[in-house]
């Protein structure tokens, strides 16, 4: 038997992936565990093997179909179970009725690129990945710019309260190396959270022209 507190948290990427993390205080030595998903009314079910990410937590991804296929809807309820092998049988360690569109975490934005760069300005665009058509335009973004001599944690957050897949960064220093990241969040869902940050995009502002103020 396993004692201690257990936490089972899952997020839906809005298309065909449910990512889960299971934390268990009591030690589980060399035990095989998995997450099993049973949606109401749908014929399919899916399983993934929990793999350790730290001493007391395990994670796995339920791949429900092709990356851009819409496998679940706003009315779906999925029974998620953590099952661990005990001898010849499986024991239910955690269970939840999972409402996918109340627990959203999208994929990080992709395809970041510099559209136009000047001495003090830079226009950057990106794309969202594997996001449901259900959202229409109901998304928001956060962006941050890494300046020389600072950390990402120190970077001020720029909030875009609409589905706007570009930004114009102002008041930059000429001939300076920067990095830029963006993340996305649907407006829908009680337990919805921000996507991971995108891969950083490195760019350099243009040098100031001699004798001119650009």
């Amino acid at each position: 038997a396993v004692n201690g507190t257990s936490q089972f948290t899952c997020f839906y990427n809005s298309r065909a992936n449910i990512s889960c993390v299971w934390s268990q205080d009591g030690a589980l030595q060399d035990t095989s565990c998995q997450v099993h998903a049973w949606p109401d009314r749908r014929r399919w079910n899916q399983t993934c093997e929990l793999l350790p990410v730290s001493q007391a937590s395990w994670a796995c991804n339920l791949i429900l179909g092709a990356p851009d296929s819409q496998k679940l809807t706003t009315v779906d309820i999925v029974t998620l179970r953590v099952l661990c092998r005990e001898g010849v049988r499986w024991r239910v360690m955690a269970i939840q009725d999972f409402k996918p569109f109340e627990n959203l975490r999208l994929m990080a934005p992709i395809s970041l690129q510099v559209v136009h760069v000047e001495t003090h300005r830079c226009n950057i665009s990106w794309e969202i990945s594997q996001a449901s058509h259900y959202f229409e335009r109901h998304l928001e973004f956060e962006a941050r710019t890494l300046s020389p001599g600072h950390t990402w944690e120190e970077a001020p957050l720029l909030t875009l309260k609409q589905k706007q897949e570009w930004i114009c960064l102002e008041t930059l220093t000429p001939d300076t190396q920067y990095e830029f990241q963006v993340r996305v969040k649907p407006l829908q869902g009680e337990f919805t959270t921000w996507s991971p940050w995108s891969q950083p995009l490195a760019f350099r502002t243009k040098p100031a022209a001699l004798g001119k103020d650009t």
């Epitope: 049973w38 109401d40 009314r41 749908r42 014929r43 399919w44 819409q70 809807t73 009315v75 779906d76 309820i77 409402k99």
Partner: antibody, heavy 118, light 111 residues
């Protein structure tokens, strides 16, 4: 033994609101979907919508703008409201319990004939 | 829109076997489970088959169900027909948005 008993007004005028209630006796109220289905005279079955014990609803798109299904878990009851009725809404209305896993309607109310006439 | 199409009526003699089809219009009928209901005049429907091929207790084994994903259809087969089997039969499933869908119904006449 699970039983569903339904009641509500049987005669309405056009533009009025249809209101029906279904009481569930025996069995668990949570863990199921609670549905409304109708059947016009001499015709087939039409799903109106459903609600689960936590209050999440799903409605037939063709009726969605006029339908409200609500639940009172303390009384083991759920209700249907259909606004702006016309003669085309004349039908026998059934409440039913739908299984979570498969969506089977195992238990049905006795049915209420609702007639819309001026 | 996903629709389930059934023959309007079928008829057969007592003791014979009859099959009622239920064909999906688009998408896959195999993405959700299929139920079959029997409805006699003046009564609420009752389940004869659920989850494609399962019989509730009390339903005779003369009733069987199947789903064929290649033809995007489900079938209800009644063998050893009896006069008491005369009724309307409805298939039921879900579309991809989990809207419950009924077939138009099939009137079974036992000659």
């Amino acid at each position: 033994q699970v039983q569903l008993q339904q009641w509500g007004a049987g005669l309405l005028k056009p533009s009025e609101t249809l209101s029906l209630t279904c009481a569930v006796y025996g069995g668990s109220f949570s863990g199921y979907y609670w549905s409304w289905i109708r059947q016009p005279p001499g015709k087939g079955l039409e799903w109106i919508g459903e609600i689960n014990h936590s209050g999440s609803t799903n409605y037939n798109p063709s009726l969605k703008s006029r339908v409200t299904i609500s639940v009172d878990t303390s009384k083991n009851q759920f209700s249907l409201e259909l606004s702006s009725v016309t003669a085309a809404d004349t039908a026998v209305y059934y409440c039913a319990r739908a299984d979570r896993r498969f969506g089977e309607l195992r238990y049905w109310g006795q049915g209420t004939l609702v007639t819309v006439s001026s | 829109n996903f629709m389930l199409t059934q023959p309007h009526s079928v008829s057969e003699s007592p003791g014979k076997t009859v099959t009622i089809s239920c064909t999906g219009s688009s998408g896959s009928i195999a993405s959700s489970y299929v139920q079959w209901y029997q409805q006699r005049p003046g009564s609420a429907p009752t389940t004869v088959i659920y989850a494609d091929n399962q019989r509730p207790s009390g339903v005779p084994d003369r009733f069987s169900g199947s789903v064929d994903s290649s033809s995007n259809s489900a079938s209800l087969t009644i063998s050893g027909l009896k006069t008491e089997d005369e009724a309307d039969y409805y298939c039921q499933s879900f579309d991809s948005s989990l809207y419950m869908i009924f077939g138009g119904g099939t009137k079974l006449t036992v000659l």
